[in-house]
Interface confidence: low
């Protein structure tokens, strides 16, 4: 299928360097191995090169030693619970020498009553209780300790959060008689963040609370809440921001109305508005001044509690979300679809590249997907030449030992960057688009066509000609 | 390892025949275009023809339109160029190469099969 | 067809130093942010290699001293800086309609 685009990289990879040590730039404090690229000014891409040719002449001596896993440690406060009273917990990979924690919120949708709840419990309990976890987990993506899978924060201390409070990281309220679960979330990222200050994050320069689908939620939710939770403990100094990565959700209307029965025909706005209760939600103090009681639920949506957000947070969202569209829903298979529901399609597009708009630092490429941070190739995706990771990169920079963002963009390193095109796939660097119900790859192209799209708008980003397109679609190739 | 390799190159006179062949190994052959190059000697690179993943579209350049024909067998990975009505202007080196999923750039090339058409 | 016009059709760097070639393009290769020029290296006897995909996008496993830029009908190959192993002749390619056409090629010599 010549339309399509996979996670897979082109051709052979060279084997990944290891980490190593290097010299630290003048006037840093000298940081013991390995290398920490908050100690680096000046020309990061030639730095990059010479570290990358350095550390692949090592790399036959030490990769065996390389251990690319997170360990498991449960929370020792064993009040800090998962939805069935077990104790929530943290994979860590420590990163001596750096200054940089990563912490990663998972994802997982949500239950938002006893019967949503029940069912979710029989059939992922996982995302519910931490019996079952594994010792440990490999980091992937933004989470990968490789230089090659993770260009921007390969040295960084690396932790994953498991999700197993359905609550999207929003709760505080223990299991009790009243409360056949508990919902936690909240509380759970604030505990695992005191527990980190006895393992090294209390001299870090730099905390990235970051998370996908509604772990991405999590993070807007909770960043401004971490940083106040480290000034009131005596760490003002370490820098708190926020990466919210497929979690940047519209309360628009469906396409088409639906009851809400389960966790996603419900619209967006009556699940997380019957969530919030049953989870004793809490959301940002100076989001909730701006909406009367009652009204909270409008702080689940990004659009309207990012300018209230004091630390700096970075937005990646695909355009057409398959989450937004599912709890929309639309269920796309690859069969025609009426021109009704191809132009609802293009305005989510259109509304969700209105809503990032003055969002200063955000990575929007017009495809259908859902979640991107911590997939393996996480750094094949561009919006108009540029990959996540380098958006990051030049965030970083623009953040440079300052909370603030800078007003005037770097030259050359963009931070903002939203596909203008206005159709799926549109964008040529988009992954595979999956039959919703198979799981199949589908021909993007063959795809576009059954939405309506006419010839020329699907050919031209395929690098087709419109005739050479009609002959593969005809072939089914 | 991705690999294009091409064979059936040698000598003819003018107006006589020759089947060029590649062969693909290491990836899935039946999800890719692939196209035929030429390079004259001491010349740039020249376009042939294309044809889609699943045969069905075919493209040749003008100057080889009814006398070239493109085919693939996905069963054996195979991709060929017949040859036909060959002029002295069709000397040159033809490369094989799979056009990538998007974008229309080419990502892996043969190695090339030399093709001399002399009397 | 889309003519693409190379320049220069042949250059003399020295080691270390920078080499800057253009490629211009007879008609628009851009379309909704995305620009369908890339670059190719080839050595005497070799096949020709990827370098540059869609303007500015590296090939995996290519040196990063390579680097792509421009958009609608002007695009640049940088090589910074130069090494001994650089020494070929250099291709842009548009795939913005069929056919594909290449640039005449620009010769770097390394001094």
């Known amino acids: 299928s010549e339309g399509r685009k996979t996670w897979r990289r082109r051709g052979q990879q060279p084997p990944p360097p290891p980490r190593t040590e290097a010299a630290p730039a003048a006037g840093q404090p000298v940081e013991s191995f390995p290398l920490d690229f908050t100690a680096v000014e000046g020309n990061m891409d030639s730095f990059m090169a010479q570290v990358k040719s350095l550390a692949q002449s090592l790399y036959p001596c030490s990769a065996q030693q390389l251990n690319e896993d997170l360990r498991l440690h449960l929370l020792l406060n064993t009040s800090v619970t998962c939805n069935d009273g077990s104790p929530a917990g943290y994979y860590l990979k420590e990163s001596r020498g750096s200054r940089r924690w990563l912490l990663f919120l998972e994802g997982g949708w949500y239950c938002f009553n006893r019967e949503n709840c029940d069912s979710r419990y029989d059939t992922m309990r996982r995302l519910m209780s931490s019996r079952d976890w594994p010792r440990t987990r490999t980091g992937t993506g933004i989470l990968s300790s490789q230089p090659e899978e993770n260009p921007y924060w390969w040295n960084a201390n690396m932790v994953f959060i498991p999700y197993c409070s359905s609550d999207v990281w929003s709760g505080a309220s223990p299991k009790s008689d009243k409360n056949e679960y508990a919902f936690m979330g909240s509380l759970i990222i604030q505990e695992v963040v005191r527990e980190l200050l006895g393992k090294g994050l209390s001299g870090a320069k730099v905390l990235l609370l970051a998370g996908s689908s509604a772990g991405g939620t999590g993070v807007l939710l909770n960043v401004d809440r971490v940083a106040e939770l480290l000034e009131e403990l005596g760490y003002p100094s370490i820098q708190v921001r926020g990466l919210a990565d497929s979690g940047w959700f519209l309360d628009n209307k469906q396409y088409r109305r639906s009851d809400c029965i389960d966790t996603i025909n419900c619209a967006p706005t009556d699940a997380i508005r019957r969530g919030i209760r049953y989870w004793s939600g809490m959301v940002p103090e100076r989001c909730q001044r701006q909406f009367k009681e009652g009204e909270e639920w409008n702080c689940f949506f990004g659009y309207k509690v990012y300018p209230t957000l004091r630390c700096p947070v970075f937005v990646v969202q695909w355009l057409f979300d398959e989450a937004q569209l599912t709890v929309d829903n639309v269920h796309l298979t690859g069969q025609p679809v009426q021109e009704g529901l191809r132009l609802y399609i293009q305005n989510l597009g259109r509304e969700l590249r209105h809503t990032l708009k003055d969002v200063p630092a955000s990575f929007a490429p017009a495809c259908l997907s859902h979640e991107i941070i911590i997939r393996s190739h996480w750094t094949d995706v561009q919006v108009k030449g540029t990959s996540l990771p380098r958006a990051l990169h030049c965030w970083d920079r623009s953040l440079h030992d300052s909370h603030k963002a800078s007003k005037t963009p770097l030259k050359g390193c963009p931070v903002h960057l939203v596909d203008s095109c206005p159709w799926p796939h549109c964008n040529p660097s988009c992954p595979t688009v999956r039959d919703q119900f198979t799981g199949q790859e589908m021909n993007v192209a063959q795809f576009l066509m059954h939405m309506g799209f006419d010839m020329q708008t699907v050919a031209q980003p395929q690098g087709l000609e419109p005739s050479e397109l009609l002959g593969m679609l005809s072939n089914g190739s | 390892e991705v690999q294009l390799v091409e064979s059936g190159g040698g000598l003819v006179k003018p107006g006589g025949s020759l089947k060029l062949s590649c062969a693909a190994s290491g990836f899935t052959f039946s999800d890719y275009g692939m196209h035929w190059f030429r390079q004259a000697p001491e010349k740039g690179l020249e376009w042939v023809a294309y044809i889609s993943s699943g045969s069905r579209t075919v493209y040749y350049a003008d100057t080889v339109k009814g006398r070239f024909t493109i085919s693939r067998d996905n069963a054996k990975n195979t991709l060929s160029l017949q040859m036909t009505s060959l002029r002295s202007e069709d000397t040159a080196m033809y490369y094989c190469a799979r056009k990538h999923y998007n974008g229309g750039y080419f990502d892996v090339w043969g190695t090339g099969t030399t093709v001399t058409v002399s009397s | 067809d889309i003519v693409l016009t190379q320049s220069p059709a042949s250059l003399a760097v020295s080691l270390g130093q920078r080499a800057t070639i253009s490629c211009r393009a007879s008609k628009i290769v851009s379309t909704s942010g995305y620009s369908y020029m890339h670059w190719y290296q080839q050595k005497p006897g070799q096949p020709p290699k990827l370098l540059i995909y869609l303007a500015s996008n590296l090939e995996s496993g290519v040196p990063a001293r390579f680097s792509g830029s421009g958009s609608g009908t002007d695009f640049t190959l940088n090589i910074h800086p130069v090494e001994e192993e650089d020494a070929a002749t250099y291709y842009c390619?548009?795939?913005?309609?069929?056919?594909?056409?290449f640039g005449s090629g620009t010769k770097l010599e390394i001094k």
């Open positions: 390619q548009h795939s913005r309609e069929l056919p594909p056409t």
